[in-house]
């Protein structure tokens, strides 16, 4: 079943997917779609990867991490109601049906009226715990079960401090991640 | 250490073609991708598209798609760049550059640039 | 294409100053961001990539910052050597797009 990931109207969600590369610069490609992940590729792509740069997205949807070192999460901007639903991050290994799929479940829930005293963060999601192995063929990734919600709208730094800090490895550790190699 | 020398000036018609080399020295040719940017007379850079040398992978800016072709002949590490069709407004200096993995591909090192006058 | 604004076309300075050239992205480009300086007659030199990682080389008072959008890179004591035309480049997309770039020149 997928993973369910949850923000408010108005502000940005995120969808966690990492791949760790075999070498530095060996990239894969990477697409992100509308709906669950069908047997090839991403349906309804909103964004895509190729071995070096972003060459396709659409309006709102943008990779705020290090894609180049293999964080592919997904920032959705400024999302609506229609937003909620399935989305597929294909990390797409060369070879016949070596690719990774993940199904992450966003739900958007209508925004509180409630003044906000600080600075707001973007989302509140529940990480997963992933584990992955390391073996001659694809890799495997088994969910551990979950963690308690992380609400993020407590913590008053912005993206980029995050990213430095000992949460945003939580976060690396305990989003859709596989190892590639 | 790495250089980077390209084809010297070039005059050409509108409606011509131009091909522009760009001979790399002092790093492992196939390890980085080679970029292609130009600057018209007192303006910006704009990227025209990249090869990457080690499986021929191009990638194209679609403002030039069609017109604009870039090969690599390792045995000599050279990489070029081919624009046709030509009109006024490709009178430019046209760069190569290298990008790699490690600086997240940005151009570090350029070649001295190639003066091309497209003039009836 | 995501556009790269550098709105000051050209910037007075003097030796010994604190300067600070912007740059603004049309849409989020994380921090995927360079900085190159440009003398008359030259190519581009690379100073500063993935928003605030100075290239190889590079003086320590050429400093970059920021994430998202906006992007600065601050020269901390300027020097004469240092007028010359820089030009910020995102590196997220492609196709890479240029600012239109920022001629520093002296009071």
């Known amino acids: 079943s997928e993973v369910e990931y949850r923000a408010e109207v108005g502000q940005n969600a995120y969808l966690p997917c990492f791949y760790t590369p075999a070498a530095p610069g060996n990239l894969v490609p990477v697409c992100w779609g509308k709906g669950a992940c069908p047997v090839f590729e991403c349906g309804n792509v909103v964004l895509r990867t190729d071995e070096r740069d972003v060459n396709y997205w659409t309006s709102r949807y943008w990779l705020n991490g290090d894609f180049r070192k293999g964080d592919v999460s997904l920032t959705i901007e400024n999302v609506t109601l229609a937003d909620s639903g399935i989305y597929c991050c294909r990390i797409q290994i060369p070879g016949i049906m070596n690719d990774e799929k993940f199904n992450l479940k966003l739900v958007i829930k209508p925004a509180k009226v409630t003044p906000a005293p600080t600075r707001q963060r973007d989302f509140t999601a529940a990480f997963p715990r992933m584990l992955t192995t390391r073996g001659h063929g694809p890799a495997e990734t088994q969910t551990l079960g979950s963690l308690p919600d992380i609400n993020l709208t407590q913590i008053s730094t912005l993206a980029n401090e995050l990213r430095d800090s000992r949460l945003a490895n939580d976060l690396r550790d305990s989003g859709a991640t596989i190892r590639i190699g | 250490q790495v250089q980077l020398v390209q084809s010297g000036a070039e005059v050409k018609k509108p409606g011509a073609s131009v091909k522009v080399s760009c001979k790399a020295s002092?790093?492992?040719?196939?390890?980085?991708?080679m970029d292609w940017v130009r600057q018209a007379p007192g303006q910006g850079l704009e990227w025209l598209g990249y090869i990457y040398p080690n499986n021929g992978g191009t990638s194209y800016n679609q403002k030039f798609k069609g017109r604009v072709t870039m090969t690599t002949d390792k045995s000599t590490s050279t990489a070029y760049m081919e624009l046709r069709s030509l009109r006024s407004d490709d009178t430019a200096v046209y760069y190569c550059?290298?990008?790699?993995?490690?600086?997240?591909?940005?151009?570090?090192?350029w070649g001295q640039g190639t003066t091309v006058t497209v003039s009836s | 294409d995501i556009v790269m604004t550098q709105s000051q076309k050209f910037m007075s300075t003097s030796v010994g100053d604190r300067v600070s050239i912007t740059c603004k992205a049309s849409?989020?480009?994380?921090?995927?961001v360079a900085w190159y300086q440009q003398k008359p007659g030259q190519s581009p030199k690379l100073l500063i990539y993935?928003?605030?990682n100075r290239y190889t080389g590079v003086p320590d008072r050429f400093t970059g910052s920021g994430s998202g959008t906006d992007f600065t890179l601050t020269i901390s004591n300027m020097q004469s050597e240092d007028l010359a035309d820089y030009f910020c480049q995102q590196h997220y997309s492609s196709p890479s797009t240029f600012g239109g770039g920022t001629k520093l020149e002296i009071k």
């Open positions: 993935y928003a605030s």
């Open positions: 849409q989020s480009v994380g921090n995927n």
């Open positions: 002092g790093y492992t040719f196939t390890d980085y991708y």
């Open positions: 550059a290298r990008s790699g993995y490690g600086n997240y591909y940005t151009m570090d090192y």
